[in-house]
């Protein structure tokens, strides 16, 4: 079952997510989506790294924490009730199945 | 192909406010934060803060906290530095910058072209 | 705040040189440092960031190097368009400092 997490209309909402990098900036594609995490990738990608940076994000997605040491958490600005549901982080891990999946809950009150 | 493009250059007085733009184009105005970078004459670059272009929420370096303002006008895509009670100290070139609103993503790789103000009684 | 400090303040060269600039941080910012480059009455242009990271449309002759507190642009063989004053930045702790900069003059 999915971790949930919670925060009020017109606030920021916080996601937690982190990996381990083999150093800092040895980086592991991550990406965040809005539904659960599928077999593969991310459905509806609103945040996304690779291997040197974040490369694409849309609009109120942001990370806050220090990536290049694997602190992946999204942050989500000035949420509102349609924020609300499953969102996915998948640590993109080289080789067959390796992904770490996390699916979090965000209740928006 | 992205842009930013700032106001003309400004000849003020001592006492007086001035309010340079910087108009943004060729991306989503709202994914990326604007920076404003002060550099006066023959010297190097300064940090004034920066303006999240989602919220609206400046960030001020402690040296510009006072008489400085940024603002944005979302949907021309602009953003805004407002200096106010000018002092010659203030003579220099400002520098509109793009940055991701990531807190650790801090280079800018796009810059405005500039607007030099220049304040004298 | 993070105090960068560039050297030298000046450097003289001639074309085909291989050229290094040198950034000190006052403290450890990991590879949280960004290089820019400033021709004479132009904005600053990024060249390299997150110390050692090239730019899309950046000569390949531009890289750098570093970790910690000590960092390093070199220009493998300098050409004439290369004059300007070259700047570091701390991009780890705001307000994301710059170093002085390093004016480089050709011959």
């Known amino acids: 079952s999915e971790v949930e997490y919670r925060a009020e209309v017109g606030q920021n909402a916080y996601l937690p997510c982190f990996y381990t990098p083999a150093a800092p900036g040895n980086l592991v594609p991550v990406c965040w989506g809005k539904g659960a995490c599928p077999v593969f990738e991310c459905g509806n990608v609103v945040l996304r790294t690779d291997e040197r940076d974040v490369n694409y994000w849309t609009s109120r997605y942001w990370l806050n924490g220090d990536f290049r040491k694997g602190d992946v958490s999204l942050t989500i600005e000035n949420v509102t009730l349609a924020d609300s549901g499953i969102y996915c982080c998948r640590i993109q891990i080289p080789g067959i199945m390796n992904d770490e999946k996390f699916n979090l809950k965000l209740v928006i009150k | 192909q992205i842009q930013l493009v700032q106001s003309g250059p400004e000849l003020k007085k001592p006492g007086e406010t001035v309010k340079i733009s910087c108009k943004a184009s060729g991306y989503t105005f709202t994914t990326y934060g604007m920076s404003w970078v002060k550099q006066a004459p023959g010297k190097g670059l300064k940090l004034m803060g920066w303006i999240n272009t989602y919220s609206g929420a400046p960030t001020y370096a402690d040296d510009f906290k006072g008489r400085f303002a940024f603002s944005l006008e979302t949907s021309a895509s602009a953003a805004y530095l407002q200096i106010n009670n000018l002092k010659n100290e203030d003579t220099a070139t400002y520098f509109c910058?793009?940055?991701?609103?990531?807190?650790?993503?801090?280079?800018?790789?796009?810059w405005g072209q500039g607007t030099t103000l220049t304040v004298s009684s | 705040d993070i105090v960068m400090t560039q050297s030298p303040a000046t450097l003289s060269v001639t074309p085909g040189d291989r050229v290094s600039l040198s950034c000190r941080a006052s403290q450890s910012i990991s590879d949280y440092l960004h290089w820019y480059q400033q021709k004479s009455h132009e904005s600053p242009r990024l060249l390299i960031k997150?110390?050692?990271q090239s730019i899309s449309g950046i000569p390949s002759r531009f890289s750098g190097s570093g970790s910690g507190s000590d960092f390093t642009l070199s220009i493998n063989s300098v050409e004439p368009e290369d004059v300007g004053v070259y700047y570091c930045?701390?991009?780890?702790?705001?307000?994301?400092?710059f170093g002085g900069g390093t004016k480089l003059e050709i011959k």
């Open positions: 910058a793009r940055k991701p609103p990531h807190y650790y993503v801090n280079s800018f790789d796009y």
């Open positions: 930045q701390n991009g780890h702790s705001f307000p994301y400092t």
């Open positions: 997150y110390a050692s």
